[in-house]
């Protein structure tokens, strides 16, 4: 059991061609965040480093924008973007915290945002 908790945007949906913000928030710890990695399955999308700033993986540069904050904006969504996304917080001295978001990209305009939930 780790000290802190990660709150995420949870299960979310968005329209094909649109954009979505992936957001995580680490709370209940005094640990310092040195880096946040954003991953889709095992693929690294982006890194936000406390010293070096943002780095977007070259293969996602056209469709991924940094922020707001430590979050990530996905643009020009396709059905293939449906799946799990992970925010990985590297902190000291706590170690690594991971949050999970499931995104469903819909063909229709019936896209709703899911409720927020907590991952211990």
């Amino acid at each position: 059991m780790m000290t802190g908790t990660i709150e995420t945007t949870g299960n979310i949906s968005a329209e094909k061609g649109g954009s979505i913000i992936l957001q995580c928030h680490l709370s209940s710890t005094t640990a310092q965040v040195t880096q946040v990695n954003w991953e889709q399955q095992d693929q690294l999308l982006a890194i936000c480093n406390a010293d070096l700033g943002w780095h977007i993986s070259p293969s996602f540069k056209d469709r991924v924008a940094p922020g707001p904050g430590l979050g990530l904006t996905l643009q020009s969504l396709t059905v293939n973007d449906t799946g799990e996304y992970f925010c990985i917080y590297h902190t000291y001295p706590d170690g690594t915290y991971t949050g999970r978001i499931f995104l469903e990209v819909l063909e229709s305009s019936v896209a709703e945002h899911g409720a927020r939930f907590q991952i211990p």
Epitope: M2, T3, T34, Q35, N49, A50, L52, H90, Y92, P93
Partner: antibody, heavy 122, light 107 residues
């Protein structure tokens, strides 16, 4: 097998700056999952945490050493260093570098260098 | 800062003895307590992390227990190579702090 090796002068004069380097082999200092640490042990005494650094340069140091400590990182050489300014005889110790790991909550120090004795004397 | 207090500071024991070392934190550190063994002239070696998890390659005669403020390192049957100094360390918060050490000597 990960190895850490400390290097630097064994004798430093009072009021000068102690400089040590830790060279990491068998693994990358740029690993996102690990932090790198300096610990010291005065002769015949216990262990004292000096500070910890991330590959990107974020540092955490012991407030008891005030602002005397800096821990630079050189990822191109797979090294991190310790610079301790305005040293006195009380800084005489064996200095160890270590890795923070494995990938568990609030990780311990799992790999250590063999240590190097630094004596502060005129 | 979190103070770590070890007891005893030294003990004498014989090969085959069961040895218990205690470590007390000045405030709750959950289970974020690690144990190290150090032999003269050598670097410390990680034995136990997260209070009770055995580090890879460490003999099963070493075990750890406890949570909150009170922790124990037990050597079930002391071997000749176990004569050394043992340190506890909290990784709950910075500054990271160590106990003063317990020297295990031959009786």
């Amino acid at each position: 097998q990960l190895q850490l090796q400390e290097s630097g002068p064994g004798l430093v004069k009072p009021a000068e700056t102690l400089s040590l380097t830790c060279t990491v082999s068998g693994g990358s200092i740029s690993s996102y999952d690990h932090y790198w640490t300096w610990i010291r042990q005065p002769p015949g005494k216990g262990l004292e945490w000096i500070g910890t650094v991330y590959y990107s340069g974020s540092t955490f140091h012991n407030p008891s050493l005030k602002s005397r400590v800096t821990i630079p990182v050189d990822t191109s050489k797979n090294q991190f260093s310790l610079k301790l300014s305005s040293v006195t005889a009380a800084d005489t110790a064996v200095y160890y570098c270590a890795r923070v790991g494995p990938d568990v909550s609030h990780p311990p120090f799992d790999y250590w260098g063999q240590g190097t004795l630094v004596t502060v004397s005129s | 800062d979190i103070q770590m207090t070890q007891s005893p500071s030294s003990l004498s024991a014989s090969v085959g003895d069961r040895v218990t070392i205690t470590c007390r934190a000045s405030q709750s550190i959950s289970s974020y307590l690690n144990w190290y063994q150090q032999k003269p002239g050598k670097a410390p070696k990680l034995l136990i992390y997260a209070a009770s998890s055995l580090q890879s390659g460490v003999p099963s005669r070493f075990s750890g227990s406890g949570s909150g403020t009170d922790f124990t390192l037990t050597i079930s049957s002391l071997q000749p190579e176990d004569f050394a100094t043992y340190y506890c360390q909290q990784s709950y918060s910075t500054p990271i702090t160590f106990g003063g050490g317990t020297k295990v000597e031959i009786k």
